[in-house]
């Protein structure tokens, strides 16, 4: 069934097969280089969808920049195909499945004085299942509460503070949320969870609850990139991939991350008996994308050169801020993950046959379900957890 996942995987986090830019991994590298010792966690699908929605209302060079930044070659795949692809993806992801819950949606908060283009509102509703809410931005505290409450409700309380402050000059806020909760196909036994050392660096050790389970896993040793990769399936179609670089090789692995690498890993997986030791952890990532995306070629939309005439007749709308927040928790019964991109316009958004594999130093993780739902680096597992023992 792993081969099926390889064939279906849209690794660019968009549904377009033809791309010149590895948006997901280029974005990862920008975030990683900006904060090399920090945890990283984001949802490529969420960010891509947010940008694609934005492109619906963008004109000329602004639209071109967004789509090219996403790595799309529109000669080979039409714009309509892109949006229809996201529409189909939303429908698929929102299908109720046993032991696997993923809800992904969009909302538009517009100032009472702003007239939105009907065509834009209609396309948002049809393609991105977007709700629209009239909002009084003059009451910035009330508006912020309205938006945060909405996101908190949609993400089952996992993202409660998407907006930390709100400029009363904001006229349109676009929110994109994703909530993911799934159980492992086979759960980890609580009795096997022990407090263990996690080496943040060779000198810095923190204690973490370390889950353990001996089982047959999809596994490979990538000698080129000097890392070990293990796939842990959820109920449903999603899989978590955990990548453990050899000592001192994190940067080498990060530099080698690409669509091609991920496909290779998924294709080369072999079933292997492993004693897997994985921290029980919680991390979150919060990013001001208006500072990040320009280095990926998406800059117009954040300046006075922005052409967002497809959204409103107001000629001076630009994206002043774009905030993306993602949270993940990994525990014995499954991984619960949540992400939100809010865009404000101000856009905010020991056995012979068994090998021991211990994630006791910084590692990478993916959650994939035909698309890359989440991508992250765990440099220091969060310890808001109750759990079992030590090495």
């Amino acid at each position: 069934e792993m081969k099926k996942r390889v064939e279906d995987l849209h690794v660019g986090a968009t549904v377009a097969p033809s791309s010149r830019r590895d948006f997901t991994f280029d974005l990862y590298r920008v975030l990683a280089s900006a904060a090399p010792s920090q945890n990283i966690f984001f949802s490529p699908v969420s960010i891509s969808m947010s940008l694609a929605m934005l492109s619906l209302g963008a004109g000329s060079s602004t639209k071109m920049q967004i789509l090219e930044g996403l790595g799309l070659n529109l000669q080979k795949s039409s714009e309509e195909e892109l949006h229809r692809g996201f529409q189909q993806l939303l429908q698929e992801l929102n299908q109720p499945r046993d032991g696997f819950q993923l809800s992904l949606g969009n909302a538009l908060f517009t100032d009472l004085v702003v007239d939105l283009q009907d065509t834009f509102v209609s396309a948002m509703k049809t393609l991105y299942l977007a709700d629209t809410f009239p909002t009084n931005f003059r009451d910035s505290a009330g508006a912020m509460k309205q938006i945060n409450d909405y996101v908190a409700k949609q993400t089952k309380g996992k993202i409660v503070d998407l907006l930390k402050n709100l400029d009363s000059n904001a006229v349109v806020i676009m929110v994109n949320y994703i909530f993911f909760k799934a159980k492992w196909e086979t759960s980890f036994n609580h009795k096997g969870t022990q407090e263990q050392d996690f080496y943040v660096t060779s000198e810095t050790v923190v204690r973490v609850p370390m889950m353990s389970r001996e089982d047959q896993y999809h596994y490979l040793l990538d000698r080129n990139l000097s890392c070990r990769v293990v796939g842990v399936p959820y109920q449903g179609n999603a899989t978590a991939l955990f990548i453990l670089p050899s000592e001192g090789k994190m940067q080498q692995v990060e530099n080698g991350l690409s669509e091609k690498t991920l496909r290779k890993w998924l294709k080369m997986f072999k079933k292997r008996q492993l004693e897997l030791y994985l921290p029980k952890f919680s991390i979150e990532g919060s990013y001001q994308l208006e500072k990040v995306l320009p280095s990926l070629g998406i800059s117009n939309v954040f300046t006075s050169h922005a052409d967002l005439s497809g959204i409103s007749n107001h000629s001076n709308i630009q994206v002043s801020e774009m905030v993306h927040k993602a949270v993940v928790e990994v525990d014995e019964s499954g991984t619960r993950a949540a992400a939100a991109t809010g865009t404000i316009f101000t856009f905010r958004s020991a056995r012979l046959n068994s090998q021991r594999l211990v994630f006791n130093r910084p590692f990478l993780m993916f959650i994939v379900d035909n698309n890359i739902l989440f991508l992250g680096k765990v440099n220091r597992p969060g310890s808001d957890y109750k759990d079992d023992d030590d090495k």
Epitope: V205, R207, S212, K386, D388
Partner: antibody, heavy 119, light 106 residues
Framework: EVQLQQSGAELVRPGALVKLSCKAS????????IHWVKQRPEQGLEWIGR????????IYDPKFQGKDNITADTSSNTAYLQLSSLTSEDTAVYYC????????????WGQGTLVTVSA | QIVLTQSPAIMSASPGEKVTITCSAS?????MHWFQQKPGTSPKLWIY???NLASGVPARFSGSGSGTSYSLTISRMEAEDAATYYC?????????FGSGTKLEIK
């Protein structure tokens, strides 16, 4: 069978140093931590520190840092605790214990070594 | 470092009586572990990760708690349970033990 065999009792003079051994059998010490614990007569347990041979990393309780020295020799599968500048406060039973992956930590203990510091 | 305070320091119980020993941590820990020690012997791991009984420990023992407050309970005291019990935290370095509770049989 997992076993930790500790060296015999020691009677030593104040100011001297002593090196205690903890020989492991039934497992490879490179794959597990070895912890050292002190118990003074009629007193409670005190964790001294531990050695992680795989990473070459040793952590001590600050109050034992500099006075006690944990080492190990993989070829003989033995861990050591060296106590220096001995005083009567060091009179105690010293235990080694094994960290655990597949079984809980501190499930296996040595029988203890009594160190008596006396003039 | 995390200080563990055990109470009571000494207690005696009659056979069949319910016994509870508590351990309070100076700051929150993930789990608590318990050891039994009898005179002249090495400590034995008794309960690990708050509530899991170590191999060979009778089912009349149980452990519970979270955060800073933990306890070990014997549902019905037996003569062989007379010993000193220590709690231990391993959530942060340095590991620490409680000062012990000496449990005697009446």
């Amino acid at each position: 069978e997992v076993q930790l065999q500790q060296s015999g009792a020691e009677l030593v003079r104040p100011g001297a140093l002593v090196k205690l051994s903890c020989k492991a059998s039934g497992f490879n010490i490179k794959d597990y931590y070895i912890h050292w614990v002190k118990q003074r007569p009629e007193q409670g347990l005190e964790w001294i520190g531990r050695i992680d041979l795989e990473k070459g990393n040793i952590i001590y309780d600050p109050k034992f840092q500099g006075k006690d020295n944990i080492t190990a020799d993989t070829s003989s599968n033995t861990a050591y605790l060296q106590l220096s500048s001995l005083t009567s406060e060091d009179t105690a039973v010293y235990y080694c214990a094994r960290g655990g992956y597949d079984v809980p930590s501190f499930a296996y203990w040595g029988q203890g070594t009594l160190v008596t510091v006396s003039a | 470092q995390i200080v563990l305070t055990q109470s009571p320091a000494i207690m005696s119980a009659s056979p069949g009586e319910k016994v509870t020993i508590t351990c309070s941590a100076s700051s929150s820990v993930s789990y608590m572990h318990w050891f039994q020690q009898k005179p002249g012997t090495s400590p034995k791991l008794w309960i690990y990760s708050t509530s899991n009984l170590a191999s060979g420990v009778p089912a009349r023992f149980s452990g519970s708690g979270s955060g800073t407050s933990y306890s070990l309970t014997i549902s019905r005291m037996e003569a062989e349970d007379a010993a000193t019990y220590y709690c231990q935290q391993r959530s942060s370095y340095p590991f620490t033990f409680g000062s012990g509770t000496k449990l005697e049989i009446k």
